[in-house]
């Protein structure tokens, strides 16, 4: 994380600042809904453990076409160190359990808020 | 398979409207965006703008007071409407789908020709 | 608005040489870590096919023989070696920022 580029600024971003993006543009998808998110799209819930960040692009990669989580989709692949593709599975999801977007989002934002707050960025 | 196919109306006069349909198949609308772009006879490609599933239109800021994108989910069908032909819009229309993340455009439909003329 | 410019405009390779075709954004096109930057290939009479993704991933079903490479503002699509199926006219697209752009393309003659 402490590599990663693009957040803000040219060079490399504090994890600090990468993280509170990621949390800022996830507050904002979940006050700016209105109709269903991503039309009601389901993903395969996670594990909120290490690891998190390629899991939860993982599941976010298959939904397509929702405008509204396409920066948080780049967002995670900037925080991923290995590609992901649509359709790849890690053992992270909890693979009986599907849940909408909208919930997935609240789940993940919940979980980096109180990542954030314990000064765990990496 | 995934298909995408446009239909148009071949001819428009000048300062007549254009309007196009893109007819998807194998695919839902709603979970995918479909993107409109157009190459004139001999030229290179041009992004006229895109429908997102969940309904957001994006237009290329050049050609915006001109265009109108919109769809019918139900009958799996797109729309391009566009105003105030000239000769310089005689170009093949191509509707085209994006991928999942980090959506490129990896289906097209064959393209619609359209001549501007008197 | 992103501008691509694409060189050269056009070139010849013999067969079985190497093809290499560049792109310059007039900004970078790179976010959190990526580049949003694609290449198709164009068969006259037909419509674009996507070769490369995110400026280096390989598109499913093209053959290894395309790779794209780069980052920020310059980016290089290489085919190497080069087939007679693979004359066509080769474009770069940037997706980072509406509007989406295409370079003005490359074409390919194979000698």
């Known amino acids: 994380l402490t590599c990663l580029g693009g957040f803000a600024s040219p060079g490399p971003v504090p994890p600090s600042t990468a993280l509170r993006e990621l949390i800022e543009e996830l507050v904002n998808i979940t006050q700016n809904q209105k109709a269903p998110l991503c039309n009601g799209s389901m993903v395969w819930s996670i594990n909120l453990t290490a690891g998190m960040y390629c899991a939860a692009l993982e599941s976010l990669i298959n939904v397509s076409g929702c405008s509204a989580i396409e920066k948080t989709q780049r967002m995670l692949s900037g925080f991923c160190p290995h590609k992901v593709s649509a359709g790849q599975f890690s053992s992270l999801h909890v693979r009986d359990t599907k849940i909408e977007v909208a919930q997935f989002v609240k789940d993940l934002l919940l979980h980096l808020k109180k990542l954030f707050r314990e000064g765990q960025f990496n | 398979q995934v298909q995408l196919k446009e239909s148009g109306p071949g001819l428009v006069a000048p300062s007549q409207s254009l309007s196009i349909t893109c007819t998807v198949s194998?695919?839902?609308?709603?979970?995918?965006?479909v993107n409109w772009v157009r190459q004139p006879p001999g030229k290179g490609l041009e992004w006229l703008g895109m429908?997102?599933?969940?309904?957001?239109?994006d237009y290329n800021s050049a050609l915006k007071s001109r265009l109108s994108i919109s769809k019918d989910n139900s009958k799996s069908q797109v729309f391009l409407k566009m105003n105030s032909l000239q000769t310089d819009d005689t170009a093949r229309y191509y509707c085209?789908?994006?991928?999942?993340?980090?959506?490129?455009?990896?289906?097209w439909g064959q393209g619609t020709s359209v001549t501007v003329s008197s | 608005n992103i501008v691509l410019t694409q060189s050269p405009a056009s070139l010849a390779v013999s067969l079985g040489q190497r093809a290499t075709i560049s792109c310059r954004a007039s900004?970078?096109?790179?976010?959190?870590?990526?580049?949003?930057m694609h290449w198709y290939q164009q068969k006259p009479g037909q419509p674009p096919k996507l070769l490369i993704y995110?400026?280096?991933n390989l598109e499913s079903g093209v053959p290894a023989r395309f790779s794209g490479s780069g980052s920020r503002a310059d980016f290089t699509l290489t085919i190497d070696p080069v087939e007679a199926d693979d004359a066509a006219t080769y474009y770069c697209?940037?997706?980072?920022?509406?509007?989406?752009?295409f370079g003005g393309g490359t074409k390919l003659e194979i000698k």
């Open positions: 085209a789908r994006d991928g999942y993340y980090p959506y490129a455009m990896n289906y």
């Open positions: 194998e695919f839902s609308l709603t979970g995918s965006s």
């Open positions: 429908i997102w599933g969940d309904g957001r239109i």
């Open positions: 900004e970078s096109v790179d976010s959190y870590g990526n580049s949003f």
């Open positions: 995110l400026a280096s």
């Open positions: 697209q940037q997706n980072n920022e509406n509007p989406r752009t």
